[in-house]
């Protein structure tokens, strides 16, 4: 990617944050070894990465969770990378699913999502999970980011 | 990314190598369909990718392993992407965890890690696992790389 | 990456398509929220991404599948990212393996593959799986793409 005023590097990497909120949208923070290249990408309300420039972006998320088959619903644990663009419907960009473990008290598993998508100015991306209480927030386990091509 | 003497492409992709060493740090080699763009990134001692230029890098690792719940410790299999910078603390950048399988003799699972991080000149990244003897070294199963934005 | 006639952005992201074919090669389509930057990368026969320019590419695939240990073969589910270059042998770039779940009727799991590779003009990449009938084609679950550095 080019460095320069015309075409600066745009990249972000944020770290998961435990939340008391009951929402399925994961919370993130600029803490630890985070990346926020400049104000052309911002973390809004601790929940979404918002870009100012149109273009192609590689967007990724990693979620580690700990669950048990007996204690969880029948449905698998699903992580979804979603897009919100001004004046458009929200949409799912990527999803991954893992069946709960039989390990006790719970079994850890990690999910990685990533892909190239066109984002409009003001577009936001966020990560949804089926059960945020199962997400692991230890160092490096759960993170979210993007880079502009 | 720009091509040119001023801002050459910097990228690497190395292939896992079985090792008799007892260390938890995985070993890598420039073999098979590997990538080493130029001398601005190097594989040192078969264990770490070291960069000469400061900047933002997308760093990734994939580890496939085969383990069995009864034959392994209670703790899950964990893969960690770690950073060593001159005069700084070593640090965990990314981690993924998978509970051992109940399949016999062992059950294969794959982990993928990836994220954007600022690296300083002379910084090195390496991959740690809880049990290197469980790692699968068949073609394409376990690899490690980076690219400079 | 540079924008301009000399060095345009090259990127693709395609979406899985269920297929009645008995081949192990996954089928893809330009549908939903897909990406196809220009004609320097094309989706050929719904099965492979073909590039016109030589260079380093980050190539990735995500496959979600649903399988059961009793109903499947002993062998794990394996996803392979493969390369076909003009006048060369096909080769495996990346593989991931997951042992089948004991969940009934089947347990979902997701695999992510990604790495940096040098591609020649006319090179094609495609994704092979051990059992295409087990692949999940719901929105966002299974996708395939690349970006030129």
């Amino acid at each position: 990617m080019q460095k320069g005023d015309q075409n600066p590097q745009i990249a972000a990497h944020v770290i998961s944050e435990a939340s008391s909120k009951t929402t399925s949208v994961l919370q993130w923070a600029e803490k630890g070894y985070y990346t926020m290249s400049n104000n052309l990408v911002t973390l809004e309300n601790g929940k979404q990465l918002t870009v100012k420039r149109q273009g192609l972006y590689y967007i990724y998320a990693q979620v580690t969770f700990c669950s048990n088959r007996e204690a969880s619903s029948q449905a698998p644990f699903i992580a979804s990378l979603c897009l919100k663009s001004p004046g458009r419907f929200e949409r799912i960009l990527l999803r991954a699913a893992n069946t709960h473990s039989s390990a006790k008290p719970c079994g850890q598993q990690s999910i990685h999502l990533g892909g190239v998508f066109e984002l409009q100015p003001g577009a936001s991306v966020f990560v949804n999970v089926t059960d945020p209480s199962q997400v692991s927030h230890g160092t490096g386990f759960t993170s979210f980011g993007l880079l502009k091509l | 990314m720009q091509k040119g003497d001023q801002n050459p492409q910097i990228a690497a992709h190395v292939i896992s190598e079985a090792s008799s060493k007892t260390t938890s740090v995985l070993q890598w080699a420039e073999k098979g369909y590997y990538t080493m763009s130029n001398n601005l990134v190097t594989l040192e001692n078969g264990k770490q990718l070291t960069v000469k230029r400061q900047g933002l890098y997308y760093i990734y690792a994939q580890v496939t392993f085969c383990s069995n719940r009864e034959a392994s410790s209670q703790a899950p299999f964990i893969a960690s992407l770690c950073l060593k910078s001159p005069g700084r603390f070593e640090r965990i950048l990314l981690r993924a965890a998978n509970t051992h399988s109940s399949a016999k003799p062992c059950g294969q699972q794959s982990i993928h890690l990836g994220g954007v991080f600022e690296l300083q000149p002379g910084a090195s990244v390496f991959v740690n696992v809880t049990d290197p003897s469980q790692v699968s070294h068949g073609t394409g199963f376990t690899s490690f790389g980076l690219l400079k934005l | 990456m540079q924008k301009g006639d000399q060095n345009p952005q090259i990127a693709a992201h395609v979406i899985s398509e269920a297929s009645s074919k008995t081949t192990s090669v996954l089928q893809w389509a330009e549908k939903g929220y897909y990406t196809m930057s220009n004609n320097l990368v094309t989706l050929e026969n719904g099965k492979q991404l073909t590039v016109k320019r030589q260079g380093l590419y980050y190539i990735y695939a995500q496959v979600t599948f649903c399988s059961n240990r009793e109903a499947s073969s002993q062998a794990p589910f394996i996803a392979s990212l493969c390369l076909k270059s003009p006048g060369r042998f096909e080769r495996i770039l990346l593989r991931a393996a997951n042992t089948h779940s004991s969940a009934k009727p089947c347990g979902q799991q997701s695999i992510h593959l990604g790495g940096v590779f040098e591609l020649q003009p006319g090179a094609s990449v495609f994704v092979n799986v051990t059992d295409p009938s087990q692949v999940s084609h719901g929105t966002g679950f299974t996708s395939f793409g690349l970006l030129k550095l």
């Epitope: 803490k31 990346t35 160092t139 | 603390f89 | -």
Partner: nanobody, 123 residues
Framework: EVQLVESGGGLVQPGGSLRLSCAAS????????MGWFRQAPGKEREFVAV????????LYADSVKGRFTISADNSKNTAYLQMNSLKPEDTAVYYC????????????????WGQGTLVTVSS
């Protein structure tokens, strides 16, 4: 700013043990990690061990793995380095360091440092 005071250094025979302590005061709520570096005579300062405050994750230099253990007592705002099976090559001044909480990957923030404590391993 964080103030760090080390203690526990001294002379020990090869194969012996020592426990170093590092007491933190000041802006301790801003600490992301605490750890140890060492500097032998005529050599550069090198990383020894670190413990991260978020979840107690630890990392060690290859040269001390299996012999040294870092730990922290948050109630006392103190980090410890238990050094076992000491070797003559472990002889150095050991420095405690603290990394501020908001040190993102593009910010090479300054660490806060202690004054150092000398460890000598000799028969």
């Amino acid at each position: 700013e964080v103030q760090l005071v080390e203690s526990g250094g001294g002379l020990v025979q090869p194969g012996g043990s020592l426990r170093l302590s590092c007491a933190a005061s000041g802006s301790i709520d801003r600490i992301n990690a605490m750890g140890w570096f060492r500097q032998a005579p005529g050599k550069e300062r090198e990383f020894v061990a670190v413990i991260y405050s978020s979840d107690g994750s630890t990392l060690y230099a290859d040269s001390v793995k299996g012999r040294f253990t870092i730990s922290a007592d948050n109630s006392k705002n103190t980090a410890y380095l238990q050094m076992n099976s000491l070797k003559p090559e472990d002889t150095a001044v050991y420095y405690c360091a603290a990394e501020p909480y908001g040190s993102g990957s593009s910010l090479i923030s300054e660490y806060d440092w202690g004054q150092g404590t000398l460890v000598t391993v000799s028969s």
